[in-house]
Amino acid sequence: SIPWNLERITPPRYRADEYQPPDGGSLVEVYLLDTSIQSDHREIEGRVMVTDFENVPEEDGTRFHRQASKCDSHGTHLAGVVSGRDAGVAKGASMRSLRVLNCQGKGTVSGTLIGLEFIRKSQLVQPVGPLVVLLPLAGGYSRVLNAACQRLARAGVVLVTAAGNFRDDACLYSPASAPEVITVGATNAQDQPVTLGTLGTNFGRCVDLFAPGEDIIGASSDCSTCFVSQSGTSQAAAHVAGIAAMMLSAEPELTLAELRQRLIHFSAKDVINMAWFPEDQQVLTPNLVATLPPSTHETGGQLLCRTVWSAHSGPTRTATATARCAPEEELLSCSSFSRSGRRRGDWIEAIGGQQVCKALNAFGGEGVYAVARCCLVPRANCSIHNTPAARAGLETHVHCHQKDHVLTGCSFHWEVEDLSVRRQPALRSRRQPGQCVGHQAASVYASCCHAPGLECKIKEHGISGPSEQVTVACEAGWTLTGCNVLPGASLTLGAYSVDNLCVARVHDTARADRTSGEATVAAAICCRSRPSAKASWVQ
Amino acid sequence: QDEDGDYEELMLALPSQEDGLADEAAHVATATFRRCSKEAWRLPGTYIVVLMEETQRLQIEQTAHRLQTRAARRGYVIKVLHIFYDLFPGFLVKMSSDLLGLALKLPHVEYIEEDSFVFAQ
């Protein structure tokens, strides 16, 4: 029947009978680094050029028999998923295949590096249109493989990779852990994360989004007209490579940062059953399933933002966590989160000419995460204003004093270790519009930006009764740029953004202690970009 | 996504006097050796030598040649399998792990990574 995966990635307005994929990725070349492929399969014949590149290790075992159909199985299927005539995502995309995996599906980091270099050389010798590189493979964490991916990405190439099939944190594998690569996890027809035997899809902060990856119909190397169903994060990555090819074909000037933000923006949100993931990974794992954009690829001028989590700081007393945006993105706010609630806040600082989001662990804490809100703001001029901690009992106020600059985020960082003596910081929209307000021993940081037509406002939501979390969402047309918690309890775990929702987390043990008068408030800064208007703070 | 994962990094700054060469005595290794945390995935004997970002094309070749020469003085044969110019400066080498200390002290070396397997997903 109609492949579930193609239906799933097709937005509802496309599902009408008249749907024909718009140009199907015809301006884009997709490089596939995988096994050998059966290039005369009806699905991909004339669409895939087999390059002369081959760098694979010997197959294991003395009695291993190279059976052509087995050698070609993985690569042929993926080529079909990307651009197959019948079951492909981007039916117009042309592909080039490089053999870096042997007949047993094994390759080496060095072979993959040489393959990536081959692509870079080809790009230098004969520059073509947009390039997508599909890496449906994974090994252990490799600094050099990640570095090579970074260099290729900075040369304008879009790299898409499998998150890995190890039911583990994707950050422990490469190239999945490379920040510049679009890392894809796998979901099934029921929007559940894919289980593969005793293992399954990888997860965590290094995954950018998920895509269909179970029972994916595609070209089989058993015969030139056969179809086979395969499962894995490779299949999921192939879907995203196809979607990327479609998007780049429609808008060839898209940068990697713009493409990633669009993939996130057009994804189906909050459809994955997160209970499958380990509890400590659920908050870090994006609840996003890739879909094609509606027929117009324009985002309607909407401000596009994503949330980037740092690695865990570790438990030492002075441990810090650092979250970074991509070079083209603006860091509009920084917050922090700690499962124990023992954190000393967050701030933005410049490292090597780039602003980064930092968070600091507190004495007795099990560690913190820094949470950056990274946005695409055309022609933005952003800066950080900070005020040292006020004397005990006094509030510290910071606002954006430059003309036409608006507040996009607030950060607070405490000098004192003792959590019991300080009242956590607050963000007040009613008394001081456009200001960050800190209390007792808090240094306050305001993120201030100027961009044509950028306007922002604060939205708050408080809960007095027992609650593990308080949320507030930005309304349609507005984008969440900043998220903070204004505590009513003695201990808050921090705040973070999930798509357009600001989530303020409260410590479990604090719930019983709370009196009805102490509301815990989630405070969101919501912004929008209206190019015709001038920058403004909305009351 | 940028911090190192579950990953082995070893400092192998061996005493520079060991080979008695004047130019080596002046260079103390600050480079690190890295390898896959999963032992079964490692490929000992093949190493990716990564040089500093600003290393020139000629210097890459000189560094590889220097490693071969110094290894030969110790009675080791080194095979340079590939030189990386276009994505990052470095080279791929087949050699005994005994030579890692020597390689880490070469000028321009940022780190050395042991080759490892990748798998179809």
Partner: antibody
Framework: EVQLVESGGGLVQPGGSLRLSCAAS????????MNWVRQAPGKGLDWVST????????NYADSVKGRFIISRDSSKHTLYLQMNSLRAEDTAVYYC???????????WGRGTLVTVSS | DIVMTQSPDSLAVSLGERATINCKSS????????????LGWYQQKPGQPPNLLIY???TRESGVPDRFSGSGSGTDFTLTISSLQAEDVAVYYC?????????FGQGTKLEIK
């Protein structure tokens, strides 16, 4: 040799249960969806159920929904149909059929007869 | 559910003559994304399981003689046997696999006149 062999049919009373098996050989079982199709004596073909290659997705005809369960064991290369609350109208030859993965059936077993009668 | 209706119910044709069987679906089985009609034809000889002849409405399964051909699109389809042979005596079924539940036509019995 590429083949499917059904077993487990027989005579059962209304309200009873039966479990059909289908042993697959000669192809990569895990990579193909599998189906059960039945044919009442002297009648046409009637699709009963399908299961995806991974076993993660199943579909049933309305007439058997809630009574029949399709499953597969990838290690044994075997497809199953657990039939509960059987009715006289379930009497048929039950065929196991390999899916091309598009929903058409490119390999069939020889069938096993299920008779529901008191 | 998509209802499949075949005509005629039975057909007698002389050896060497052309046999034509029609199949109509209650809704289109053409998938625009790949421009394929999700329709197959099966042959079932007495005492045997069905055998796939045609898929995608017009593509012959490997090993099927070229006297068998399929045509049509959307909702109307035809199976043609260009020159009837004795071994073609069987019941022929069309099937839509556009969506579950998969449905078959009621069958057409082909005999020799």
């Amino acid at each position: 040799e590429v083949q499917l062999v059904e077993s487990g049919g027989g005579l059962v009373q209304p309200g009873g249960s039966l479990r059909l098996s289908c042993a697959a050989s000669g192809f990569t079982f895990n990579n193909y969806a599998m189906n059960w199709v039945r044919q009442a004596p002297g009648k046409g073909l009637d699709w009963v159920s399908t299961i995806s290659g991974s076993g993660g997705t199943t579909n049933y005809a309305d007439s058997v929904k809630g009574r029949f369960i399709i499953s597969r064991d990838s290690s044994k290369h075997t497809l199953y149909l657990q039939m509960n609350s059987l009715r006289a109208e379930d009497t048929a030859v039950y065929y196991c059929a390999k899916d091309s993965n598009w929903g058409n059936f490119d390999l069939w077993g020889r069938g096993t007869l299920v008779t529901v009668s008191s | 559910d998509i209802v499949m209706t075949q005509s005629p119910d039975s057909l007698a044709v002389s050896l060497g003559e052309r046999a034509t069987i029609n199949c109509k679906s209650s809704q289109s089985v053409l998938y625009r994304s790949n421009n394929r009609n999700f329709l197959g034809w099966y042959q079932q000889k007495p005492g045997q399981p069905p055998n796939l002849l045609i898929y995608w409405a017009s593509t012959r399964e490997s090993g099927v003689p070229d006297r068998f051909s399929g045509s049509g699109s959307g909702t109307d389809f035809t199976l043609t046997i260009s020159s009837l042979q004795a071994e073609d005596v069987a019941v022929y079924y069309c099937q839509q696999y556009y969506t579950t539940p998969y449905t078959f036509g009621q069958g057409t019995k082909l005999e020799i006149k």
